[in-house]
Each structure stands twice: as C-alpha cells, then as structure tokens.
Amino acid sequence: ARPLEEALDVIVSTFHKYSGKEGDKFKLNKTELKELLTRELPSFLGKRTDEAAFQKVMSNLDSNRDNEVDFQEYCVFLSCIAMMCNEFFEGCPDKEPRKK
Amino acid sequence: ARPLEEALDVIVSTFHKYSGKEGDKFKLNKTELKELLTRELPSFLGKRTDEAAFQKVMSNLDSNRDNEVDFQEYCVFLSCIAMMCNEFFEGCPDKEPRKK
C-alpha cells in the first residue's frame, strides 16, 4: 500500500482501537477520547491534560451533542489538525510561496 | 512520532508533493490531482482512469468552483474515503456490533 493509503488505514484503525473499549463500540466516549488523545496525539494535547481541557475538546468535537464522538466527528477533528499542520508547513520560510 | 501523528504528516506532505508542481503551489490543479490519485491512491481509483472519471472527481472535490483543490477540500475528500473504509471496517463479520 502507498503511504497515503496506509495513513487512511491508521486513521480508521486508531479510532476502533479506542472506540471498542466501552459503551457503543463505534463511538468514542470521553474516557476513550482522552486515552486516544493522550496516547496517539500527545503533540496536539501538549500540556492541556486537566479535566476541563478534555471536556472542552470533547464538546468541540461532539457536533451532534450526544456526549460521544462518532467517526465523522473524528474525521472533522483530524482534518482540523491537518489544516493546522498545513498552515505551519505553508508558513515555513523554505516553503515560501513562489511563482511557478 | 506516533502512527496517527505520522499519518497526519503524510496527509500534509503528500498534498504538497503534488500541489507544488505547477500553478498555485498550495492548490492541486486537475493534472496534479490526477497524478496524486493515480500514484498515491490507486486503490481508490481502481479502473476509473478515463478522463471523464477524473473530471467527475475534480468537480466533486472543488467545492468553491475555482477549478483547483485546496487543502481543505483535499481533507474533506480524504475524510470521505476514510468514512468509506470505516463503513467497510464496521461491516466486517468479525467486527459485528456487540453489547459491551
């Protein structure tokens, strides 16, 4: 598989690695989300490990307000992180826009 | 870096690997998109390599109708593919919903 295909596989498998632990096996509850963020995206969380920070992340992701994060909401979240990474990438001096 | 963080890096770097080839270096034109899909997502395209198929994909991704695919549109596209992969994943017999 090509790296981008593998990346998509990782996105799917990581979700299910945590969503399957308790409750609805196809959704992340707060405990599962917390574990996923802490273990799989430590660079995103940084030092924000207090309870209120997790609650805020959960609330921001939970667009249908069911106290869980489904796969679509998770994808929107990862897209947001990717877009932040992309802004950093585009802002690097050696990546400065050039006329092509 | 954790696998999920690496996956996000791959998503960003793959976009720029192709968007930087011609025109606006932060957007994929039709030629760049075609090359990205053919080389990086062959399993998505399958046998749909005719011009009309590419036009259709391009049209579906280009939500702001500027004949180019920006990073946000690309993320939406990858999210859709991830969601298709996820539906397949959830539909597997060994992944059948279970009461937990």
């Epitope: 409750g23 209120a52 609650q55 609330s59 307000r65 106290n67 | -």
Partner: antibody, heavy 120, light 107 residues
Framework: QVQLQESGPGLVKPSQTLSLTCTVS?????????WNWIRQHPGKGLEWIGH???????NYNPSLKNRLSMSRDTSKNQFSLKLSSVTAADTAVYYC?????????????WGQGTLVTVSS | DIQMTQSPSSLSASVGDRVTITCRAS??????LNWYQQKPGKALKLLLY???RLHSGVPSRFSGSGSGTDYTLTISSLQPEDFATYYC?????????FGGGTKVEIK
C-alpha cells in the same frame, strides 16, 4: 459572573417573524460553549428550541426546524433567533441560555426570559 | 424524542423536611440528567448535572442519584428559599427535553 439578557418585541402579529437577540456579558463569547434558546408556554413546561456553537454548528428542535433560523455575532457577544410564520401557539417566555461543556451539557446560565405574545 | 416524566407534579412540605422528586426517561439516558430550580420572575438555576454533580454555589443539601431511566433529586432538609419549581432535563441526545416540573409548596 456570566449574564445573559434577551431583547426583542413583546408583541408579534400572527404569520410574522419573531426576532430575539441575546447579549452575553461577563464572559467572552467563546467556542467552548453552545448558546441556546428555550421557551416556556404560559403555565407550562420548558421546550428546547435550538442552539449555536462550535464553528457555527447549529442544531434545531425538529418540531420547529422549518421555521427557525439562528445566528451569532461574536464581535457583539450576541446570538439571535428568528421564528417565522408565528401563531398563538408560539406565545411563550423565551429564554437564552449557555450550555456548558461538562458531561450532559447542562444549561449553566440563563437569561431572565422575555415574554413574547402572538396576537393581532 | 426522549420523553421525561416527573413526579409528583406538586407537593406540600415543611421547612426541615426531606423531599424527593423523581424523573423517568423513556429510554436509557446514561446518567446525562440535569436538574434546575425555577422561582417566579427569576432566571432558572442549574442545581445538578450528570445525575449527581453539584453545580458551583449550590448547597450540599441538594443531591441526585439514579441510572438508566430512573433518577431522583433529594433535598435533605428543606429551607425557606427552596420553595420553587424543579425540572429535570436529559442531556443524552438532541432534541433536549425537560420533565413537566414539580412545584414544591409550603404546607
């Protein structure tokens, strides 16, 4: 201390559009909260109307969805409600509330409420 | 929609009494149950969220319990300022729904 204040006309004619605004003070109008409208018919219980929140995400009560519109103006710390084609059944006290990000998303702050009467 | 049924609809009690109000949901709401107090002409107040968590500034005489579909609000020793109407509300799913209310009156 967070304070919410509803404003708008107290009397609306049938078939017209009810427009209300809620002004939030004492707290920045951040993405961490959802901002709700709830109503209470005279002598009756409470009915959730809808809310607006993170990234402009909006959810409406399906029973009112086709007549509802919500928006927000972060620069003014305000959010608003528009309910079209009103009838006498829309006569109620309308409350704006803040929805916390804690488990179960409770409404932790409420406005005093404003009575809207639909009558010709 | 999830239906919330509160009982009793009203009750008479004296200062110092222990008061219990129950709330039943039409389906499992996984402890996402909130309680509010309403006094005439005043803004509603959040008392408890997630079944039993006390909102800041709420006296400890208020407590909550329950799971699944059945929940309870208890006032251990009724005070003069507690005479009001109480509402339960489910935060499990949209649309949010409330119980019909319980009016606590002076005996």
């Amino acid at each position: 201390q967070v304070q919410l204040q509803e404003s708008g006309p107290g009397l609306v004619k049938p078939s017209q559009t009810l427009s209300l605004t809620c002004t939030v003070s004492g707290d920045s109008f951040t993405n961490d909260y959802y901002w709700n409208w709830i109503r209470q018919h005279p002598g009756k219980g409470l009915e959730w109307i809808g809310h607006i929140g993170y990234g402009g995400n909006i959810n409406y009560n399906p029973s009112l969805k086709n007549r509802l519109s919500m928006s927000r103006d972060t620069s003014k710390n305000q959010f608003s409600l528009k309910l079209s084609s009103v009838t006498a059944a829309d006569t109620a006290v309308y409350y704006c509330t803040r929805e916390s990000f804690y488990d179960g998303y409770p409404f932790d702050y409420w406005g005093q409420g404003t009575l809207v009467t639909v009558s010709s | 929609d999830i239906q919330m049924t509160q009982s009793p609809s009203s009750l008479s009690a004296s200062v110092g009494d222990r008061v219990t109000i129950t709330c039943r949901a039409s389906q499992d709401i996984r402890n996402y149950l909130n309680w509010y107090q309403q006094k005439p002409g005043k803004a509603l107040k959040l008392l408890l969220y997630y079944t039993s968590r006390l909102h800041s500034g709420v006296p400890s005489r208020f407590s909550g319990s329950g799971s699944g579909t059945d929940y309870t609000l208890t006032i251990s020793s009724l005070q003069p300022e507690d005479f009001a109407t109480y509402y339960c509300q489910q935060g499990n799913s949209l649309p949010r729904t409330f119980g019909g209310g319980t009016k606590v009156e002076i005996k």
